[in-house]
Interface confidence: low
């Protein structure tokens, strides 16, 4: 997260760290007791590595009573996700067992109504991604509030040049932005999960390259079918 600040500890009980061989790889969001939603591209280079999900965490390194690392029983990328596109960049991870719920671990309601969030709406994005362009990784969860950007502006030639489909949404990126390591994390508007941080190689903090988020409402049928 660029231009953000440390989150209040455990105030986002839905927040997950998707880990590869014990290290933070991507963000994720607990959407059901046994399911975490993340970005498909996160596991592209995972190969034979061990993928796990950390729940109930604020610090990645410090012991916390609510922290627990779960093995992954099944990883389900969206069937249409492809390595070279930002489209359909969703991944569902089934935990090895139902998460132990409590004040610091709780699923987040996700948007089912397929309607665009109004431009200018302030949404919260959180993650353990880099906090500066030197690549410094934080130990504690960071967050930032970002205004939603209308699709027409986001699709300008100088911005994302028509790449933002109706299944994607954008948020402003003027010095405050999601960044490397935040992919798969939640964009939360009004207490509801609206978007998932895409995991492309977009530069961060660049006003002319807004943040791109996959609209979960557009994938309600797929999410329901996997969770069923």
């Amino acid at each position: 997260i660029l231009g953000g600040r440390e989150a209040e500890a455990h105030a986002r009980p839905y927040m997950a760290s998707v880990q590869l061989n014990g290290a933070h790889l991507c963000g994720g969001v607990l959407v059901a007791e046994q399911w975490v939603l993340s970005a498909a591209h996160c596991l592209e280079d995972a190969a034979d590595g061990k993928v796990q999900v950390l729940l109930g965490a604020h610090s990645l390194s410090q012991p916390e009573p609510s922290k627990r690392l779960y093995d992954v029983l099944r990883a389900v990328p969206h069937p249409d996700s492809q390595p070279d596109t930002i489209d359909h960049d969703l991944l569902l991870l089934q935990l090895s067992e139902k998460a132990t719920l409590g004040p610091a671990v709780r699923p987040l309601p996700w948007q089912r109504v397929d309607r665009d969030v109004a431009p200018g709406t302030l949404c919260d994005v959180a993650g353990w991604g880099i906090v500066n362009h030197a690549g410094r990784r934080p130990d504690s969860l960071q967050h930032v509030l970002l205004p939603v950007l209308d699709r027409a502006t986001c699709n300008r030639r100088t911005h994302h040049d028509g790449a933002i489909t109706e299944r994607l949404m954008c948020a402003e990126s003027n010095r405050r932005d999601s960044c490397k390591g935040d992919s798969g994390g939640p964009l939360v508007c009004g207490g509801v999960l609206e978007g998932v941080v895409t995991s492309g190689s977009r530069v961060c903090g660049n006003r002319k390259k807004p943040g791109i988020y996959t609209r979960v409402a557009s994938y309600a049928a797929w999410i329901d079918s996997v969770l069923a």
Partner: antibody
């Protein structure tokens, strides 16, 4: 120490294309956190941003000039160029090339830390 | 018209303080930068990110940006400070934009 130097014809006929080149020494035009820009100053007036080329080669143009301006680069020569088509007397100005420092990303319009001395271009028949 | 508005001219007595303003409704969101341009020369960066001086710029030059107005202050103006001063920031398209410039005369 970075140095930038403009070159090109000082006189261009109306309706023709103005072509200028900026040669950069002391630093690569492909370096991250910098873009390279063209700025002009009509006689007795203020500065006008025309466009930039980022370190990855992507270009950004002033909306008022977008239909007429093209900025390109030649990394092997460490040069970038400006072409302005269909010129009129209104395009008479001193043209500067400059380095655009970006604080946050490879392209983020920020401030201009190195400027060329400028080249006077007059549009006249 | 420019998205940034500067007075076209300003006079100050030698040794006095000159304040050059730059107004723009997006200045609360963006940094302001200032350039000095002497007759027949290229602009030179003298203040960036509202209030930071590049190395080699005298301490008498300072800047601020508050409430939609950026101000360049020259404390104890010298004869060699007579020049045009340009503010620069970003406009509503997030493109670089300059003010119209202010000519400072040192009396």
């Amino acid at each position: 120490q970075v140095q930038v130097q403009e070159s090109g014809p000082g006189l261009v006929k109306p309706s023709q294309t103005l072509s200028l080149t900026c040669t950069v020494s002391g630093g690569s035009i492909s370096t991250s956190y910098y873009a390279w820009s063209w700025i002009r100053q009509p006689p007795g007036k203020g500065l006008e941003w025309m466009g930039d080329i980022a370190n990855d080669g992507s270009t950004y143009y002033s909306p008022s000039l977008e239909s007429r301006v093209t900025i390109s680069r030649d990394t092997s020569k460490n040069q970038f160029s400006l072409q302005l088509s269909s010129v009129t007397a209104q395009d008479t100005a001193v043209y500067y090339c400059a380095r655009l420092r970006s604080l946050y990303t490879d392209y983020d319009p920020h401030y201009y830390d190195y400027w060329g001395q400028g080249t006077q271009v007059t549009v006249s028949s | 018209s420019s998205a940034l508005t500067q007075p076209s001219a300003l006079s100050v007595s030698k040794g006095q303080t000159a304040r050059i303003t730059c107004q723009g409704n997006l200045l609360p969101r963006h940094y302001a930068h200032w350039y000095q341009q002497k007759t027949g020369q290229a602009p030179k960066l003298i203040v960036y990110d509202d209030n930071i001086r590049p190395s080699g710029i005298p301490e008498r030059f300072s800047g601020s940006n508050s409430g939609g107005v950026a101000t360049l202050t020259i404390s104890g103006a010298q004869a060699e400070d007579e020049a045009d001063y340009h503010c620069q920031s970003a406009d509503s398209n997030d493109d670089a934009v300059f003010g119209g410039g202010t000519h400072l005369t040192v009396l």
